[in-house]
């Protein structure tokens, strides 16, 4: 008799999830010498242990602690780039500016980027059919809790000047409900972080508005300032030129505003 299976509103676990995580771990540890000591089988076991046999709406940060411990990594705390709703450009940037890091440039972020996963209560099976949706089902699901946990730790580690890339094409350039707005902002440590610098990325070619004056940016400025962290903001009017100038800073066209 087939066992009844909970139907969730979100997509199921990514195909070949265990193999993908293991392969990514191996690849990452090969590329990053400082992480060569990591045993990828142990990493997978810890990852699996965080959600297998557990109700996918009852996952806690505690469940991920063994994985966090194994994935402990030191990145230069003054070279952190946060982002919100503009992941691709943030990643393109750190691929060029190799001394800066997004969360997905760390081992744990790299392992889980763009993946979905969940298990089922009291069985060792991975659910490939459906997983809980954050809004429609529950917020304490395996994926959301993972990103909340690693995002908090990443923000807590930051120091000096922290940069954040924000999408100027969205109605809410700064969204209090995003991971950046709900987790990272509140876990920057005022004792270590002097300034949060926002880069607002413009979408339209002819968009010359000062998006740093947007009401949501003013809201971010106030939230950050009240954490005793200074705030600054820059418009990136031409993201394509911005990336080009990161690649070739000596280019004569790179002295003008981008």
């Amino acid at each position: 008799v087939p066992r009844w299976r909970q139907q969730w509103s979100g997509p199921g676990t990514t195909k070949r999830f265990p193999e993908t995580v293991l392969a990514r771990c191996v690849k990452y540890t090969e590329i990053h010498p400082e992480m060569r000591h990591v045993d990828c089988q142990s990493v997978w076991d810890a990852f699996k242990g965080a959600f297998i046999s557990k109700h996918p709406c009852n996952i806690t940060e505690e469940d991920y602690q063994p994985l966090m411990k194994l994935g402990t990594q030191t990145v230069p705390c003054n070279k952190i780039l946060l982002w919100s709703r503009i992941k691709d450009l943030a990643h393109q940037f750190t691929q060029v500016q190799r001394d800066m890091f997004t969360l997905e440039d760390t081992l744990l972020g790299y392992l889980a980027d763009d993946l979905t996963w969940c298990g089922e209560f009291n069985t060792s099976k991975i659910n490939y059919q459906s997983c809980p949706d954050w809004r429609k089902d529950c917020s304490n699901n395996p994926v959301s809790v993972f990103w909340k946990t690693v995002s908090r730790r990443f923000a807590e580690a930051a120091c000096d000047v922290v940069h954040v890339m924000l999408n100027g094409s969205r109605s809410k350039i700064f969204d209090k409900n995003s991971t950046f707005g709900s987790v990272e902002v509140h876990n920057l440590q005022p004792e270590k972080v002097q300034t949060l610098e926002a880069w607002v990325i413009h979408g339209g070619r002819e968009d010359s508005r000062d998006l740093c004056q947007d009401p949501t940016i003013k809201e971010l400025e106030s939230i950050i300032s009240k954490r005793n962290i200074q705030f600054s903001c820059k418009n990136i009017y031409r993201p394509d030129k911005f990336l080009q100038c990161v690649k070739n800073p000596e280019d004569s066209s790179c002295t003008s505003e981008i």
Partner: antibody, heavy 114, light 111 residues
Framework: VEESGGRLVTPGTPLTLTCTAS????????VTWVRQAPGKGLEWIGI?????TTYYATWAKGRFTISKSATTVDLRIASPTTEDTATYFC?????????????WGPGTLVTVSS | AAVLTQTPSPVSAAVGGTVTIKCQSS????????LSWYQQKPGQPPKLLIY???TLASGVPSRFSGSGSGTQFTLTISSVQSDDAATYYC???????????FGGGTEVVVK
């Protein structure tokens, strides 16, 4: 930092106080205005951020305006009353910080009297 | 608007003794810790002592300490010296800047 512009004014006469700094540029720091009536406690008036964004205490809204130039931060008292008689301090969040006030001027006295 | 109540005032202490000043807020300060303490002597501007509830400002003697979170905060002066005679103020910062305020002040008299 140092405040200037304090003087005797008649009620209703607008007055602008100026905060200047030596050794660093105020435009790169958060600056707060505070006042103290004779023999009384401190009152938080408002703050201006590096960006120029301003916030005011509820009681001060509409009565005071904080603005900045490249080198100074001003406090304008739109229509002073006798209750505005006080020593006015500007305080800078220097070298780091925002609402924390490590650097204060000596104050400038404003007397409102007819 | 937020109200910050400081108690007691005045407070008197002997040299070498300990003084505790309380600051109670009618609502929680930002991040539960955005409260600072200032010392003011007659004819002088205030001087920052403690910020973010418990962080000692640069150059301030370690006999000054701050504690508390949310709505209840304390400034403690241990091994009181005659130079500590002054009025002490707390400053609370709130989600709505309109509520930002100093406490009424506590005068410390050293005998």
């Amino acid at each position: 930092v140092e405040e200037s512009g304090g003087r005797l004014v008649t009620p209703g006469t607008p007055l602008t106080l100026t905060c200047t700094a030596s050794g660093f540029s105020l435009s790169r720091y958060y600056v707060t205005w505070v006042r103290q009536a004779p023999g009384k406690g401190l009152e938080w008036i408002g703050i201006i951020y590096i960006s120029g964004t301003t916030y005011y205490a509820t009681w001060a809204k509409g009565r005071f305006t904080i603005s900045k130039s490249a080198t100074t931060v001003d406090l304008r008292i739109a229509s002073p009353t006798t209750e505005d008689t006080a020593t006015y301090f500007c305080a800078a969040a220097w070298p780091v910080g925002t609402y924390v006030l490590p650097l204060w001027g000596p104050g400038t006295l404003v007397t409102v009297s007819s | 608007a937020a109200v910050l109540t400081q108690t007691p005032s005045p407070v008197s202490a002997a040299v070498g003794g300990t003084v505790t000043i309380k600051c109670q807020s009618s609502q929680s300060v930002v991040n539960a810790n955005n409260l600072s303490w200032y010392q003011q002597k007659p004819g002088q501007p205030p001087k920052l002592l403690i910020y973010l509830a418990s962080t000692l400002a640069s150059g301030v003697p370690s006999r000054f300490s701050g504690s508390g979170s949310g709505t209840q905060f304390t400034l403690t002066i241990s091994s009181v010296q005659s130079d500590d005679a002054a009025t002490y103020y707390c400053l609370g910062v709130y989600d709505d800047d309109g509520d930002n305020a100093f406490g009424g002040g506590t005068e410390v008299v050293v005998k």
